[in-house]
Amino acid sequence: QSPIFGPQDVSSIEGNSVSITCYYPDTSVNRHTRKYWCRQGANGYCATLISSNGYLSKEYSGRASLINFPENSTFVINIAHLTQEDTGSYKCGLGTTNRGLFFDVSLEVSQVPEFPNDTHVYTKDIGRTVTIECRFKEGNAHSKKSLCKKRGEACEVVIDSTEYVDPSYKDRAILFMKGTSRDIFYVNISHLIPSDAGLYVCQAGEGPSADKNNADLQVLEPEPELLYKDLRSSVTFECDLGREVANDAKYLCRKNKETCDVIINTLGKRDPAFEGRILLTPRDDNGRFSVLITGLRKEDAGHYQCGAHSSGLPQEGWPVQAWQLFVNEESTIPNSRSVVKGVTGGSVAIVCPYNPKESSSLKYWCHWEADENGRCPVLVGTQALVQEGYEGRLALFDQPGSGAYTVILNQLTTQDSGFYWCLTDGDSRWRTTIELQVAEATKKPDLEVTPQNATAVIGETFTISCHYPCKFYSQEKYWCKWSNDGCHILPSHDEGARQSSVSCDQSSQIVSMTLNPVKKEDEGWYWCGVKEGQVYGETTAIYVAVEERTRGSPHINPTDANARAKDAPEEEAMESSVREDENKANLDPRLFADEREIQNAGDQAQENRASGNAGSAGGQSGSSK
């Protein structure tokens, strides 16, 4: 007996699709060896139609696929657009030749059934409504009208014009006539269920003069659409149930052995397993909606169904659409952290992977909100303004060519806890979900800026310092000016790096930034941060207010004032002013050509007059003595 297992008999009708699953023993060799589907000929030879090596025969071109699922020890052969010529004996198997391990499968494709000429065939999906048309002669215009269903030789009345309705059709069947028509009546049966299928006879009148019509009703169960997605990618279920259920609650459910468990519905129900990674979006007023699930997991594979009912739950006789989702574990999407932890007042740097082939795509970051259907308003993007409430504390740093971008959020509060999505306008599979957990801080932040109430005076020099601990000693320190389209890094010079790490003084590691002279447009948010290459770390933010010099007030160098406020040694304050000229920096390298030109240029952008100097205050005082 063969260790390969599958369906021995598969039967379908022309035009349909089949999905044949073959099961193989779970061994490393089996998982990686060639899988094939071949057709058994009269001569005993089995001609390959499709294989996992990429072979596809002419007769299967454009209508078949073979997909291996090594994690389940199965492979699936999908064949669409069946014709009667597909009827025959096949083998699904493993091995380099078609004589290896195999299982025999018989496929029978029948014609769509034909009925006698007087039989009208009605084909409807589960949950839909059928209108059966019944013609009669004028002589039976005033006679009793009825519709019955054939059960063997008997024909059991479903509904008649005396207002009788079979209990199993109660509230589903109505008999009516349209307008002034004298030769036709109709029977509507709504909320169709599989057992409604069969042969019906409608009748007007009694005895030999009765007019009879045959109607064959076929109730189709949803043919699941097969979806193949990579681990960690996303899937969208597009559900179009028709206008008749436009005003009913919608749901997506996942079938288990017994029922169909609702994952999300428009009444606010949501499965906790999908928290933070699901969105239900109405598409139009005709009942169309879509459900997006991101961060696909292995356990998300399975059978899904969308539907509509006022209860928001699956109900017999209501329209449904079905899918079978396969999740491929051999994913191109890199594994990234699903939970990021931060503390109040601190910051987080979240790395968002994207398809490296689409480095020019627009990048976004949105906050998943749990209201009813779930929604994800964009907070920041490469061409999107930062959302209100996030000014000065949120920025997106694109790293073209690296296949990732970084989103930094600082000044964290516990309200920032929740789920966030990384997405691009390119490959929709590359949507990643991050849960941000913000706990109450139990210690001082790693980065501290002084002075904390920063007010600069127009025309004067203003220096602000960022203190960092020794653990950031080897990392690159930077200052950047935040704006709605990012945080533009200001050039800096790290003197602290000259100091030996052994003698690192925890209290004296400083990166300072000087504005000289201060201009009105210098007002805004500035960030001090650390990074290693493309990897961003901790940041802290400070708002620098800019004001006019009040008339009559003495000219005090704010740098000296800041130093005095800290009770800093005199030489440190002196050193700051000594470096005043040195601190004029420029972001545009073309402007470094002639230092005097920079000093004389009156209308340079704010970044062109800001500088960041990183160093150790201890080192500075040592060098000035």
């Epitope: 297992f5 369906p7 021995q8 008999d9 598969v10 039967s11 379908s12 009708i13 349909n16 699709s17 089949v18 999905s19 044949i20 099961y23 389940n72 589960i126 269920i193 599989p194 057992s195 076929q218 189709l220 169960e221 949803p222 043919e223 699941p224 079938k255 288990n256 052995k257 017994e258 029922t259 169909c260 399975g302 059978h303 699956p314 017999e316 006789g317």
Partner: nanobody, 126 residues
Framework: EVQLVESGGGLVQAGDSLRLSCAAS????????MGWFRQAPGKEREFVAT??????????YYADSVKGRFTISRDNAKNTVYLRMNSLKPEDTAVYYC?????????????????WGQGTLVTVSS
């Protein structure tokens, strides 16, 4: 919940035929897989045959021991699944259980099926 009721069991001679029926009621609209398992005295319950359907496509699975002798079929309108057993052997003696599921991962696995009938006894004498 889906209720399953088996019928058609009995005592037959080796080589005879029998047809088992399994009628489903309740929330049958979510059921797309129905199968037969059997349990001989002192043995574990084992897979016999399963029918899965999707629209107008049927997939029939059989255990090697019954291939060519047993045939599984269904009547959609009656929510009933049948097992036609030909050329019965004494080793086919067992309680035959009907099982139903909404999904099919591996038809041979008992834990794939959520709903079970009470069983019907088939005795094949030699």
């Amino acid at each position: 919940e889906v209720q399953l009721v088996e019928s058609g069991g009995g005592l037959v001679q080796a080589g005879d035929s029998l047809r088992l029926s399994c009628a489903a009621s309740g929330r049958t609209f979510t059921t797309y897989v129905m199968g037969w398992f059997r349990q001989a005295p002192g043995k574990e319950r084992e897979f016999v045959a399963t029918i899965a359907w999707s629209g107008s496509t049927n997939y029939k699975y059989y255990a090697d021991s019954v291939k060519g002798r047993f045939t599984i079929s269904r009547d959609n309108a009656k929510n009933t699944v049948y097992l036609r057993m030909n050329s019965l052997k004494p080793e086919d003696t067992a309680v035959y259980y009907c099982a139903a599921s909404t999904v099919l991962t591996d038809p041979r696995r008992l834990n794939e099926y959520a709903n079970w009938g009470q069983g019907t006894l088939v005795t094949v004498s030699s």
